[in-house]
Every structure is written in structure tokens, then in C-alpha cells.
Interface confidence: medium
């Protein structure tokens, strides 16, 4: 018998369903147990920019420690404000700095991602280490990446359509699921049904779906049934703020008594069949009907309470952004550029508009130095000699002051330029890990210790080692020591920085060939990066040091195969 119930989209104020899933449009998970670097690749597609994204990395400790470094490659198609959480994880992040803006300083090593197509990005990532996971996500709001979790049977990660990332990756789409509703014809009363249908996924085993149900009505006002239908391997953990009738497939339990499993029923696996089930249970209204991919957490917010159902003519749109300006986010968008003895601040109007901010003024600390409106952006420029610039031996500092229409206080942000003329970079070679006695001689088979310094020191910037190699001339070739801020090979170790923040590493040099070169050049590329703010202020320098090489040792790591 056909059930007459014309499912129509329900307005977001009547019902909204958000969910977290490990199903991705394309993806792969592979095992790389012996890799020094755990590589993860995320391809993120956003239908409209700019978007906000919360990205959390979680480490599962092995033997009480987190042994491996992690490279996360982030490929995005439009502007993203990224809120990154990766506490205690030795993370290297490769991304496009013109598209990704951090809400707060990432506090991790970063590398510019070349503008390659997807296949080449995967190849580029694979050159750095075996890929543990890769996924393509459409309009994510938040992503949780669990490290050290890869359960894949593959030893090589190749993107395949409609994949389940298991425990490795869970994500929440920005667009809530389409919620539909209808009146069940010929049924009297006010009983409402909430139907959730979880579609089969590529699951490798039993799954528990947590269903959070929040109905905003007084407890006495509600007569409702919750119908949960899914594949046989799914059980349900229900967290509801109201008592209601429960009708599920598989088994279910309640969050308040998680150990008490209750057997469910055999339910039809078609929308028509589920509507029939709701009718059989005496529901007069289907307040929400939702079909979802296999999810780990589903949240249903509804406010129908058995009242008159309101449907909306159009499908539910993405949750609208706040129409209140976030000054903190706004200030993070100010880009600082330093060139030709001048500081330039740039604020793109497109991003400002997205944050619903109305700017009434952008100045330096000296309010007479005002930004000019250049159509698509505000530009504020001043020579180092004016507008209240504070010039020190290593740095030029000022303050960006932004007046926002809705805020009674101007927003302030410290801005800095490096005084490159006064900065000097030095490479130091030491024979012991105490870094006390400098030397210019290395001995094959003996560990050498290297430290890079900048003077005078610059507290607002971070000094980082991007790459180092040892050039041993035509005889000895080149030994790569550090690449992409990671140690190359077993004979190189990145060490903790000095108390002043100077980067340090050690290396061990061996030769299999003769003649052994008598001299070499140690060459390191270093970067000064702002501890807060944008990557556009990065300064790169290459520093050289001539070394003498003494007494051979014919075992161990080699400079040339």
C-alpha cells in the first residue's frame, strides 16, 4: 500500500541535521609502518570562498611516545581561514599560502605547496615519504585526522572513489543534511516521527552511530517516535533530551546506560517503507526524514513538537555565517609586506565582506597615516622613517589600528618588518653536543654539530632551517643533510633549538670512495618567519661555511653510492 506523504524540504529553523562521517568521495588509507615520515594528503573543495575550517590532528601514542614526524599536504581550491590544532605533533604543513590563512599562528613548520594538479601533488608528497592517507573532501567544516591509526590493507595509497577512511579521518560537511518532512494523510493526533536512514558505506566492520536528538519543546508537549534504519553492521547509541519511542534496526543503547543493549527490529530499507512504519506507529507528521552516508555522529535539532509542520520551498542552504564581525579574525587577515624601506599593510575587501565587517578606518599608530581604498583592497603604506615607526637594530615595528562600525574600541595588531641590513646569519660547527667550542674541521666517522644564529636576535620571528647540504666538490659530490626542514637519512638528526631558539642539527659523515676530499662547503638555507601573522613576511637567506676534512674512516653512511 502506498503511503501518501509528500516529503518536502523543511526550513532550518524547524529541523537541522549535521553529521560526522569517515566516508569520502575519493580516498585511500595505506600502511607505512617503517616510514620515518607519516604523509597525509587532503584535497579540499569549497564551492564558494572564503570558508572557515577546523582541522584537528590527534596522535595515538605508541609505547608512550609519538615517534614519527608528520607531513600534511593541504590542497585547496579557494580561500580558507584555518583553525589548526596539532598539539605536541612534529608537524610539517605544505599548503598554498595565498589561499590558506591561519586564524592563529600555526606553530608548525610550513612549506609552500607548488601549484600542481592532483596527480602531481600526490607524486610530490610521495617523494617525501610513503603516503599513509589521502582524501578528497567537498566543503568540510571540520576534519579530524588520527595519526598512527592507518588500518589499510594497501601498502600504496591510490585514490579510489567512495572510500571509508575508518578511524584515520572523520569530517563534518558544512552543509547540513537535507531534512524533509510531510503530513501522513488520514492519521489523527499530534504524534511526530523523526526518521534517520543511514546508507550503506564501504565499512570494514561493525559501526556504532551516535545519534544526538535535541528537541526544543517542554517534555509534556511531545509525543514522538525516533526511527533509525541502517545496514546490519550498524548499532546505535542514542543521546536524546526527551523521552520518545525508539524504533531501530540492529541494536541500540542509550548514552546514560551505554552497556545496556536493546535489540531492534527488521525495518524496511526504502523511504516508502519507512514512511509506512511511521504511519503504523500512529505518527501524523514526519517532522524530519533524513538520508545520510554512513556516519559516526549525527545531531538532529528540531522544534516541531507535534505542531503544524512548515516546509520550505527550497532545499536547506548552508548555515549562514554570523552577521556580526569577528574583529579577531579580521585582524588576522592583515598582510604585512616589507620592501624598499617601507611597510605596506594590505586588507582584501572580499575577505572583510565575508566576515560581515564594515571598516571605517585603517591607520598606523599615528592616526594621520590612513589607508587608501584601492577598489578591491585597503592599502596602508609608510616609509620606515614616518607614521610612528619604531626602529630597532633588528626590526621596524608599528601598530595597525582598525575601526569597525559596530565596535566601540578600535582593534589593534602589532606589525613588524625585519631590518635586513642590520641582520647577520652565522653557521657554527661544533665537535660536541654542548656547542661550546667552534671548529671548522670535520672528521669522517665523528659526529659534527651545527648551529645557525641570527644577530641581533629577533624575538617576534622564528629562525628555522629549511635545507642544508654539504658540497664536497667534483670528487665527493653533494650530501643532502636537511630537506624541507626534515633530516635526510639515518646519519642526520635535528636537535632541540638552543635556549635562544637557534636551530641545531648533527650529522655523521663517512666515505666509501677515495680520494677523500680535503675541503667542503656547508650550505644552509634558513628562514625567519613571524611567530604571529602571515607567511608573506618570511625572509630566506643562504649561509655558507668552508670546512676542512681530516683522516679517513671507511665504514657507515656514505656521501656517494
Amino acid at each position: 500500500e502506498t503511503v501518501h506523504c509528500d516529503l518536502q524540504p523543511v526550513g532550518p529553523e524547524r529541523g537541522e541535521v549535521t553529521y560526522t562521517t569517515s566516508q569520502v568521495s575519493k580516498g585511500c588509507v595505506a600502511q607505512a609502518p617503517n616510514a620515518i615520515l607519516e604523509v597525509h594528503v587532503l584535497f579540499l573543495e569549497f564551492p564558494t570562498g572564503p570558508s572557515q575550517l577546523e582541522l584537528t590532528l590527534q596522535a595515538s601514542k605508541q609505547n608512550g611516545t609519538w615517534p614519527r614526524e608528520v607531513l600534511l599536504v593541504l590542497s585547496v581550491n579557494s580561500s580558507v581561514f584555518l583553525h589548526l590544532q596539532a598539539l605536541g605533533i612534529p608537524l610539517h604543513l605544505a599548503y598554498n599560502s595565498s589561499l590558506v590563512t591561519f586564524q592563529e599562528p600555526p606553530g608548525v613548520n610550513t612549506t609552500e605547496l607548488p601549484s600542481f594538479p592532483k596527480t602531481q601533488i600526490l607524486e610530490w608528497a610521495a617523494e617525501r615519504g610513503p603516503i599513509t592517507s589521502a582524501a578528497e573532501l567537498n566543503d568540510p567544516q571540520s576534519i579530524l585526522l588520527r595519526l598512527g591509526q592507518a588500518q589499510g590493507s594497501l601498502s600504496f595509497c591510490m585514490l579510489e572513489a567512495s572510500q571509508d577512511m575508518g578511524r584515520t579521518l572523520e569530517w563534518r560537511p558544512r552543509t547540513p543534511a537535507l531534512v524533509r518532512g510531510c503530513h501522513l494523510e488520514g492519521v489523527a493526533g499530534h504524534k511526530e516521527a523523526h526518521i534517520l536512514r543511514v546508507l550503506p558505506g564501504h565499512s570494514a566492520g561493525p559501526r556504532t552511530v551516535t545519534v544526538k536528538v535535541e528537541l526544543s519543546c517542554a517534555p509534556g508537549d511531545l509525543d514522538a517516535v525516533l526511527i533509525l534504519q541502517g545496514p546490519p553492521y550498524v548499532s546505535w547509541l542514542i543521546d536524546a533530551n526527551h523521552n520518545m519511542q525508539i524504533w531501530t534496526t540492529g541494536e541500540y543503547s542509550f548514552k546514560i546506560f551505554p552497556e545496556k543493549n536493546i535489540r531492534g527490529f527488521k525495518l524496511p530499507d526504502t523511504p516508502q517503507g519507512l514512511l509506512g512504519e511511521a504511519r503504523m506507529l500512529n505518527a501524523s507528521i514526519v517532522a524530519s526524514f533524513v538520508e545520510l552516508p554512513l556516519a559516526s555522529i549525527v545531531s538532529l535539532h528540531a522544534s516541531s513538537c507535534g505542531g503544524r509542520l512548515q516546509t520550505s520551498p527550497a532545499p536547506i542552504q548552508t548555515t549562514p555565517p554570523k552577521d556580526t564581525c569577528s574583529p579577531e579574525l579580521l585582524m588576522s587577515l592583515i598582510q604585512t609586506k616589507c620592501a624598499d624601506d617601507a611597510m605596506t599593510l594590505v586588507l582584501k575587501k572580499e575577505l572583510v565582506a565575508h566576515l560581515k565587517c564594515t571598516i571605517t578606518g585603517l591607520t598606523f599608530w599615528d592616526p594621520s597615516c590612513e589607508a587608501e581604498d584601492r577598489g578591491d583592497k585597503f592599502v596602508l603604506r609608510s616609509a620606515y622613517s614616518s607614521c610612528g615607526m619604531q626602529v630597532s637594530a633588528s626590526m621596524i615595528s608599528n601598530e595597525a589600528v582598525v575601526n569597525i562600525l559596530s565596535s566601540s574600541s578600535p582593534q589593534r595588531k602589532k606589525v613588524h618588518c625585519l631590518n635586513m641590513d642590520s641582520l647577520s646569519f652565522q653557521l657554527g660547527l661544533y665537535l660536541s653536543p654542548h656547542f661550546l667550542q667552534a671548529s671548522n674541521t670535520i672528521e669522517p666517522g665523528q659526529q659534527s654539530f651545527v648551529q645557525v644564529r641570527v644577530s641581533p636576535s629577533v624575538s617576534e620571528f622564528l629562525l628555522q632551517l629549511d635545507s642544508c647540504h654539504l658540497d664536497l666538490g667534483p670528487e665527493g659530490g653533494t650530501v643532502e643533510l636537511i630537506q624541507g626542514r626534515a633530516a635526510k637519512g639515518n646519519c642526520v638528526s635535528l636537535l632541540s633549538p638552543s635556549p635562544e631558539g637557534d636551530p641545531r642539527f648533527s650529522f655523521l659523515l663517512h666515505f666509501y670512495t677515495v680520494p677523500i676530499p680535503k675541503t667542503g662547503t656547508l650550505s644552509c638555507t634558513v628562514a625567519l618567519r613571524p611567530k604571529t601573522g602571515s607567511q608573506d613576511q618570511e625572509v630566506h637567506r643562504t649561509v655558507f661555511m668552508r670546512l676542512n676534512i681530516i683522516s679517513p674512516d671507511l665504514s657507515g653512511c656514505t656521501s656517494k653510492g
Partner: antibody, heavy 116, light 108 residues
Framework: QVQLVESGGGVVQPGRSLRLSCAAS????????MHWVRQAPGKGLEWVAV????????YYADSVKGRFTISRDNSKNTLYLQMNSLRAEDTAVYYC?????????WGQGTLVTVSS | SYELTQPPSVSVSPGQTARITCSGD??????AYWYQQKSGQAPVLVIY???KRPSGIPERFSGSSSGTMATLTISGAQVEDEADYSC???????????FGGGTKLTVL
């Protein structure tokens, strides 16, 4: 450190006036918008008024509009609330509050009692 | 002008999770801010812009906002968290500030 010290509270008869002051220190007073917020005994917080950092804009809750005036003297680092035509329902602890995007900083408050 | 509604009281045992809600028609579009006020003391900000935590506030305090409801969550509530908690929001269209009625959190 940031300090906001309210003064001028006390007992006053209905219909009379009172002027509250708030002395600010530990920050650049002229860079911040300031609010007055009150809390009647045993009740929740109620926003009263706001003044822009430079005094250019002032806004009031409907319950005090036309009776209360917020002002500031940036040279003296002081915020004021002139309260006229006081009513019994104006009895409350009045807090002076510094505005900023990442939240407000509150003084300890001064008690105003309107009673005959 | 709109209103913000909070439950008058919430009780939890030490170590449990406390959730305090604040509902208002404007919250899908406005940020929620949360204050803690201990007896006889001035209020202290614990969450701003829905979910951001000021420095110095313990990590057990978190905030979220979905639809017309903002929620302050205290994971593993402690006896010292016993206080009144108020939400507020700024109606920037009229430059008014709206407070919720406050919720008394009891940690038994």
C-alpha cells in the same frame, strides 16, 4: 595591570540624581570603548550604556534612555554616568566595563540604592 | 530587540560535564559570550565569539553554537566552578547588548 574603580554610589531618594565615576588605569583608556552594566540584587546582569573610545557615539538601554547620560574624559582616564530621575528599579550594583572584541574587563562595582 | 533565555539552575557532581544553554532567535547570526560570576565578585569572561577561550581560562571550559542555541560546556566540572554563568550577545544593528537571565551552576 588593568584596573577599573567605580565610585559615587550610595543611597538616594527617588527622583533625585547621582553621578558615578570610574577611574581607569593600567591601559590606554582613550583606545577603548566603555560600558556601564548593572545588576539588581539577586537578579541577572543588565546592560545600561556604551560610549565609543573617542566619545563620538553613545547608546543606551531603553530602560534608562532620556534619564542617564554616559560621558568620558580621556585626559583624566575617567568614565562617568550621570543618573537623573532615579527610580526604585534603578537600585543595583553598577559596573564599569572596558570593551574589547575578545570580551570585557569589569570593575568591582558600586552599589546604588534608590529608596525613600 | 531580542531576548536570551537560560535555565535558572544546573547541578552536576564533581568530574561530570556541565552544559549550560542560552537560546535566542538572533543567535544563528550573533556571537555568544559567556561570563562567570562568583558570589560577591565581578564577572569574568570565560568564552567569547561562541567558542573562543581567553588566555588564563582552563581548557575544561568550551563553547559552541548551533542554530538558536549557544552552549557553555564545562568538562569535568570542579567545585571552584560553582558560580552564576551569564551569556550575552551584541545587537549591532542598534548597538545594544542583551544578557541572558543567568544560570546558577551547583557542583555538588
Amino acid at each position: 595591570q588593568v584596573q577599573l574603580v567605580e565610585s559615587g554610589g550610595g543611597v538616594v531618594q527617588p527622583g533625585r540624581s547621582l553621578r558615578l565615576s570610574c577611574a581607569a588605569s593600567g591601559f590606554t583608556f582613550s583606545s577603548y570603548g566603555m560600558h556601564w552594566v548593572r545588576q539588581a540584587p539577586g537578579k541577572g546582569l543588565e546592560w545600561v550604556a556604551v560610549i565609543w573610545y573617542d566619545g563620538s557615539n553613545k547608546y543606551y538601554a531603553d530602560s534608562v534612555k532620556g534619564r542617564f547620560t554616559i560621558s568620558r574624559d580621556n585626559s583624566k582616564n575617567t568614565l562617568y554616568l550621570q543618573m537623573n530621575s532615579l527610580r526604585a528599579e534603578d537600585t543595583a550594583v553598577y559596573y564599569c566595563v572596558r570593551d574589547y572584541s575578545s570580551g570585557w574587563y569589569w570593575g568591582q562595582g558600586t552599589l546604588v540604592t534608590v529608596s525613600s | 530587540s531580542y531576548e536570551l533565555t537560560q535555565p535558572p539552575s544546573v547541578s552536576v557532581s564533581p568530574g561530570q560535564t556541565a552544559r549550560i544553554t542560552c537560546s535566542g532567535d538572533a543567535l544563528p547570526k550573533k556571537y555568544a559570550y559567556w561570563y562567570q560570576q562568583k558570589s560577591g565578585q565581578a564577572p569574568v569572561l570565560v568564552i567569547y565569539e561562541d567558542s573562543k577561550r581567553p588566555s588564563g581560562i582552563p581548557e575544561r571550559f568550551s563553547g559552541s553554537s548551533s542554530g538558536t542555541m549557544a552552549t557553555l560546556t564545562i568538562s569535568g566540572a570542579q567545585v571552584e566552578d560553582e558560580a552564576d554563568y551569564s551569556c550575552y550577545s551584541i545587537d549591532s544593528s542598534v548597538n545594544h547588548v542583551v544578557f541572558g537571565g543567568g544560570t546558577k551552576l551547583t557542583v555538588l
